[in-house]
């Protein structure tokens, strides 16, 4: 029976993933019962990705390592809509690392997942980035401009945002 074997496969995948994320929240995609997309609980979901706000304060490198241990990376923001979704879950008095850095200090910004850096889809605060020694990007709130990006020193501990593709089972 097709449905039975699909369910067995799904359960075995869930069991495998449970050792990393004890609880998954899954939804049926479209009308096809075959496709379930999941995010770990209590991650949030938007389009084809899952997001986790890490409130522990760590350097940029440690923040990225923390995300990768969970099967994610520091967040790569591809659209204004994605940023608008993310900021709903952020606190205005905090700053959060993005998956964006300038390792050489030459203003060659790089996303951790190798997505090409596109000047036309960036949300820097006005006047930012402004320091060649500040090689990592955060998102924070400024009363004059609301949410935007700023360059800071990578070793300064911040909160962070992890992003992973939805888990399909």
């Amino acid at each position: 029976n097709f449905m039975y074997s699909k369910t067995v496969k799904r359960l075995s995948k869930l069991r495998e993933y449970q050792q990393y994320h004890p609880s998954l929240t899954c939804v049926m995609e479209g009308k096809d019962i075959e496709d379930w997309s999941c995010c770990p609980t209590p991650w949030t979901s938007f389009q084809s990705s899952c997001y986790f706000i890490s409130t522990g304060m760590q350097s940029w490198t440690k923040s990225q390592k923390n995300c990768s241990v969970m099967g994610a990376d520091l967040v790569v923001i591809n659209t204004r809509e994605e940023q608008d979704f993310i900021i709903q879950n952020l606190k205005r008095n905090s700053s959060y690392f993005l998956g964006l850095s300038d390792p050489g200090g030459r203003r060659h910004w790089q996303w951790v997942d190798q997505t090409p850096y596109n000047e036309n889809v960036t949300f820097w605060h006005s006047g930012e980035p402004n320091n060649l020694d500040e090689r990592c990007a955060i998102i924070n709130f400024r009363s004059s401009e609301e949410w935007g990006w700023n360059d800071i020193h990578c070793h300064v501990p911040q909160k962070s945002i992890c992003k992973m593709k939805k888990i399909y089972i």
């Epitope: 495998e16 993933y17 050792q19 990393y20 990768s68 241990v69 969970m70 099967g71």
Partner: nanobody, 126 residues
Framework: QVQLQESGGGLVQAGDSLKLSCAAS????????MGWFRQAPGKERDVVAA????????YYVDSVKGRFTISRDNAQNRVYLQMNSLKPEDTAIYYC?????FGSGYYTNKLNYAYWGQGTQVTVSS
């Protein structure tokens, strides 16, 4: 937590072959995307090859395409790098790396990898 141990390095002549092996212990190996990186003295650690969890998707840096082959054996918890037609410029310490992955992609940025082996030296003499 995943522990990785590379083996198979050594000193060979240009044109020779070597097969590197990386043994993984710890969590379910089949849920980890794997990569081979190398670091020559005074240089950055760069990706050589990468492979997805199911072994179906692979990546090679241009300089090794057609000469190196990455493969994995999920039953044995191992990933391999078969290196043929070795050149002096392949001399480096070779590192195996792992990252948890729930998709079917590979990863080419060293920042994407959470776990690393200690490395194995490969020296190619002319």
């Amino acid at each position: 937590q995943v522990q990785l141990q590379e083996s198979g390095g050594g000193l060979v002549q240009a044109g020779d072959s070597l097969k590197l092996s990386c043994a993984a212990s710890g969590r379910t190996f089949s849920t980890y995307a794997m990569g081979w990186f190398r670091q020559a003295p005074g240089k950055e650690r760069d990706v050589v090859a990468a492979i997805a969890t199911n072994g179906g998707t692979t990546y090679y840096v241009d300089s090794v395409k057609g000469r190196f082959t990455i493969s994995r054996d999920n039953a044995q918890n191992r990933v391999y790098l078969q290196m043929n037609s070795l050149k002096p410029e392949d001399t480096a310490i070779y590192y195996c790396a792992a990252r948890l992955s729930f998709g079917s992609g590979y990863y080419t940025n060293k920042l994407n990898y959470a776990y690393w082996g200690q490395g194995t030296q490969v020296t190619v003499s002319s």
